[in-house]
């Protein structure tokens, strides 16, 4: 029984509001209750918006003043419950809900996948490590249940020991050359321009697990660089295609202080990682333009810019190189923070749903932390297939190899 109607004086609603037009105040007199009057008035004053049964796919309708609300069943959404949620579950929408990689399929639901060293959980979206040291995780933080590093670099902070475990220090003839990024146990990514002036290729050393350059704490691992692979399109002394892939003579041993950064799939990097605003850059580079280099590894959080915005916000310099589709800008134009000489080749690492990925390589800029200029980074997503193909290839004789690109 409808208690709401039973309480009305017989005939009053019929007489006052059905046979004649009544006002809100007259209805208020009948109902004696503001809430009940409001419920009646919504339908009475502008008709029942639910009368046409607008809610589809089994949704229930609630009339409102000049409108209605649909309450949808779990699998549907949209104003009229017209959209099947699985139809919206596509990779361009929030990475399809996937923790790592997402693939669209025609006619069927998208599927999630995980990077090597991870496996997909039963929920179909989450990834769990299957190895002790999966890429993109920071063991010392995972073990103490912390999340992001505190957070070279001009205007940055010291990267606490072990919180940048993929950082590589490159030495030539015993002197600091550049940074690099470990992407698996035998491969390091760096910048091509680091090798422009190398004469003694046999004296290239990569050091992993390094933190303080003035101290040997036992966590470091040094390896000879067996091969330096540079794209055939890179021209020494220029800025485009500034990437190098280094093969180590022996694999490193993964530890709490030596862990690779994940090399992402191209589509994931382009449609998801590229839209993560802040990323970390790190290195032992100069602390000021023309200043001393850092002894402790430094890290800096930098915002990424669309190239158009970067060009609009940068001061025009006559001899400034173009920012091509193989680069991107990141950082600050106020002169406060930037990567610098000595950081070159180091990682621009992006965090997404619990895992870190390589998205850029410290490449070039107009000075360091120069007012009106941003840092420019190699856009790693353009080289994923090139890198993967080379990592599957057999070693070739000679240290320097120029490999066709694309």
């Amino acid at each position: 029984a409808n208690a709401f109607l039973e309480e009305l004086r017989p005939g009053s609603l019929e007489r006052e509001c059905k046979e004649e037009q009544c006002s809100f105040e007259e209805a208020r007199e009948i109902f004696k209750d503001a809430e009940r009057t409001k419920l009646f008035w919504i339908s009475y004053s502008d008709g029942d918006q639910c009368a046409s049964s607008p809610c589809q796919n089994g949704g229930s309708c609630k009339d409102q003043l000049q409108s209605y609300i649909c309450f949808c069943l779990p699998a549907f959404e949209g104003r009229n419950c017209e959209t099947h949620k699985d139809d919206q579950l596509i990779c361009v929408n929030e990475n399809g809900g996937c923790e790592q990689y997402c693939s669209d399929h025609t006619g069927t639901k998208r599927s999630c996948r995980c990077h090597e060293g991870y496996s997909l959980l039963a929920d179909g979206v989450s990834c769990t490590p299957t190895v002790e040291y999966p890429c993109g995780k920071i063991p010392i933080l995972e073990k103490r249940n912390a999340s992001k590093p505190q957070g070279r670099i001009v205007g940055g902070k010291v990267c606490p020991k072990g919180e940048c475990p993929w950082q590589v220090l490159l030495l030539v003839n015993g002197a600091q050359l550049c940074g690099g990024t470990l992407i698996n146990t035998i491969w390091v990514v760096s910048a091509a321009h680091c090798f422009d002036k190398i004469k003694n290729w046999r004296n290239l050393i990569a050091v992993l697990g390094e933190h303080d350059l003035s101290e040997h704490d036992g966590d470091e691992q040094s390896r000879r660089v067996a091969q330096v692979i540079i794209p055939s399109t890179y021209v020494p002394g220029t800025t485009n295609h500034d990437i190098a892939l280094l093969r180590l003579h022996q694999p490193v041993v993964l530890t709490d202080h030596v862990v690779p950064l994940c090399l992402p799939e191209r589509t994931f990097s382009e449609r998801t990682l590229a839209f993560v605003r802040f990323s970390l850059v790190s290195g032992w580079g100069q602390l000021l333009d023309r200043g001393a280099t850092a002894l402790e590894l430094m890290v800096l959080n930098v915002p990424r810019l669309m190239t158009q915005d970067c060009l609009q916000q940068s001061r025009k310099v006559g001899d400034s190189p173009n920012i091509t589709e193989y680069m991107f800008c990141a950082g600050y134009s106020d002169g406060s923070k930037d990567s610098c000489k000595g950081d070159s080749g180091g990682p621009h690492a992006t965090h997404y749903r619990g895992t870190w990925y390589l998205t850029g390589i410290v490449s070039w800029g107009q000075g360091c932390a120069t007012v009106g200029h941003f840092g420019v980074y190699t856009r790693v997503s353009q080289y994923i297939e090139w890198l993967q193909k080379l990592m599957r290839s057999e070693p070739r004789p000679g240290v320097l190899l120029r490999a066709p690109f694309p």
């Epitope: 015993g174 390094e210 303080d212 350059l213 003035s214 000879r224 002894l295």
Partner: antibody
Framework: QVQLKESGPGLVAPSQSLSITCTVS????????VSWIRQPPGKGLEWLGV???????YNNSALKSRLSISKDNSKSQVFLKMNSLQADDTAMYFC????????????WGQGTSVTVSS | DIVMTQSHKIMSTLVGDRVSITCKAS??????VAWYQQKPGQYPKLLIY???TRHTGVPDRFTGSGSGTDFTLTISNVQSEDLADYFC?????????FGGGTKLEIK
């Protein structure tokens, strides 16, 4: 230029302790590590331990707890203290500066001779 | 501890000759190996580090090579002033360890 100079007692009685000072110039102890190495007469080199710029020390476990290394950055001095000396501790004791990145000892002192005898 | 073995205690050579002094590690230490020269009555001097990088001021007749566990110091065109003891050292792991040394004699 870089210089290191060791100064020690020369003669130490058995079971007594040894103290040697390494005074450095041409570099800062806050930036570079200093190792201690010894060489018994007519024999090879034995690494004893190191103190790094930040103050961390690493000792050769073969010497157990007999060895301690410390420093005074403001005086540019590094100290080696060794307890319970025996005849086989007789040696030339060297201090040596470490370079960056390489962990190698790129500059050495002339050494100070220590004889353990009663 | 890592043991560094220099199998030749003494090596004899003529002025102008080429000599190779070898060093074997008990485990992989590549490339964290250094070579030192100690002339009679003097302190050791660094010659080579990272297995093959010459220290500042070291003549280019001194060359370091090798990998893994086997390392070599080669002196080409030996000079009389090269008469000395030569020690290899690993700095891959603590404690740092030295080889027993090779005495180079000039005939």
């Amino acid at each position: 230029q870089v210089q290191l100079k060791e100064s020690g007692p020369g003669l130490v009685a058995p079971s007594q302790s040894l103290s040697i000072t390494c005074t450095v110039s041409g570099f800062s102890l806050t930036d570079y590590g200093v190792s201690w190495i010894r060489q018994p007469p007519g024999k090879g080199l034995e690494w004893l331990g190191v103190i790094w710029g930040g103050g961390n020390t690493y000792n050769n476990s073969a010497l157990k707890s007999r060895l301690s290394i410390s420093k005074d950055n403001s005086k540019s001095q590094v100290f080696l203290k060794m307890n319970s000396l025996q005849a086989d501790d007789t040696a030339m004791y060297f201090c040596a500066k470490h370079g960056y990145y390489g962990y190698v000892m790129d500059y050495w002192g002339q050494g100070t001779s220590v004889t353990v005898s009663s | 501890d890592i043991v560094m073995t220099q199998s030749h205690k003494i090596m004899s050579t003529l002025v102008g000759d080429r000599v190779s002094i070898t060093c074997k590690a008990s485990q992989d230490v590549d490339p964290a190996v250094a070579w030192y020269q100690q002339k009679p009555g003097q302190y050791p001097k660094l010659l080579i580090y990272w297995a093959s990088t010459r220290h500042t001021g070291v003549p280019d007749r001194f060359t370091g090579s090798g990998s893994g566990t086997d390392f070599t110091l080669t002196i080409s065109n030996v000079q009389s002033e090269d008469l000395a003891d030569y020690f290899c050292q690993q700095y891959s792991k603590y404690p740092y360890t030295f080889g027993g040394g090779t005495k180079l004699e000039i005939k």
